[in-house]
């Protein structure tokens, strides 16, 4: 699985990585002005896990299972 993955939050992450086989999802989440793009585990694609892991109380997130599916426009849909 390929995901956009930036180590630190950035407004427009364009770094694509081949996620290791442990990861079966891509995540994009926005918390205030911070946007996170990550390789992720689908079992952790829920509000509680995302907020705990990002240490953010309020956010919107989108998980997906296709290559490079975690781009900004997904959060606007």
């Amino acid at each position: 699985l390929q995901c956009y993955n930036c180590p630190n939050p950035t407004a427009d992450c364009k770094t694509a990585v081949n996620c290791s086989s442990d990861f079966d999802a891509c995540l994009i989440t926005k918390a205030g002005l911070q946007v996170y793009n990550k390789c992720w585990k689908f079992e952790h694609c829920n509000f509680n896990d995302v907020t705990t892991r990002l240490r953010e109380n309020e956010l919107t997130y989108y998980c997906c299972k296709k290559d490079l599916c975690n781009f900004n426009e997904q959060l606007e849909n």
């Epitope: 993955n5 180590p7 630190n8 770094t15 990585v17 996620c19 290791s20 086989s21 442990d22 990861f23 996170y36 990550k38 585990k41 079992e43 952790h44 509680n48 896990d49 705990t52 892991r53 990002l54 240490r55």
Partner: antibody, heavy 121, light 107 residues
Framework: EVQLLESGGGLVQPGGSLRLSCAAS????????MSWVRQAPGKGLEWVSY????????HYPDTVKGRFTISRDNSKNTLYLQMNSLRAEDTAVYYC??????????????WGQGTSVTVSS | DIQMTQSPSSLSASVGDRVTITCRAS??????LAWYQQKPGKAPKLLIY???TLAEGVPSRFSGSGSGTDFTLTISSLQPEDFATYYC?????????FGQGTKLEIK
């Protein structure tokens, strides 16, 4: 304050079994992945197992696969490592560690003090 | 499995020195690299993750750099409490592997 307290180590004969426990406090245990890492005397660090927050996924290196089993009881805030068919090369200090620092999988930010396991006849 | 190779295995330096430790991965791990410090008889302590991001409470004299396969940990001005063993670890995916360690000793 985050605390991880391992127990269950000791002396065991080759081929024997041991169950390590790690009691967690000071954080939402059920929301964090956990790992066990060991260190043989005078040697470096070796990761031995991982379990996701809900227990849905586990990972092991080939050196312990089929012999060690990681599990957790989120109602008791406790992590376990069941070690079977122990070998001399399993002799080490075993640390439990909290995993998932700032949304990064497999980064361990808090560690216990360790429990010592000796496998010898 | 991804192999992590550190160099040097040991290093002697003095307080105030600038020290660099290197870590090489056997394949591309992007920026999925962490550094830990361990003192004798103690548990490891997380210093850096994502190759260059300092963990909470870590002094700014520590810095990390690199991506892909080659990484460095730099201590800009050694303090007495920095003499310890340092390990790199990739966090790209399982199985996790550590470097063999670099023991930093007082000259």
């Amino acid at each position: 304050e985050v605390q991880l307290l391992e127990s269950g180590g000791g002396l065991v004969q080759p081929g024997g079994s041991l169950r390590l426990s790690c009691a967690a406090s000071g954080f939402a245990f059920s929301s964090y992945d956990m790992s066990w890492v060991r260190q043989a005397p005078g040697k470096g660090l070796e990761w031995v197992s991982y379990i996701s927050s809900g227990g849905g996924s586990t990972h092991y290196p080939d050196t312990v696969k089929g012999r060690f089993t990681i599990s957790r009881d989120n109602s008791k805030n406790t992590l376990y490592l069941q070690m079977n068919s122990l070998r001399a090369e399993d002799t080490a200090v075993y640390y439990c560690a909290r995993d998932g620092y700032y949304a990064e999988y497999y980064v361990m930010d808090y560690w216990g003090q360790g429990t010592s396991v000796t496998v010898s006849s | 499995d991804i192999q992590m190779t550190q160099s040097p295995s040991s290093l002697s330096a003095s307080v105030g020195d600038r020290v660099t430790i290197t870590c090489r991965a056997s394949e591309n791990i992007y920026s999925y690299l962490a550094w830990y410090q361990q003192k004798p008889g103690k548990a490891p302590k997380l210093l850096i993750y994502n190759a260059k991001t300092l963990a909470e409470g870590v002094p700014s004299r520590f810095s990390g750099s690199g991506s892909g396969t080659d990484f460095t940990l730099t201590i800009s001005s050694l303090q007495p409490e920095d003499f310890a063993t340092y390990y790199c670890q990739h966090h790209y995916g399982s199985p996790l592997t550590f470097g063999q360690g670099t023991k930093l000793e007082i000259k």
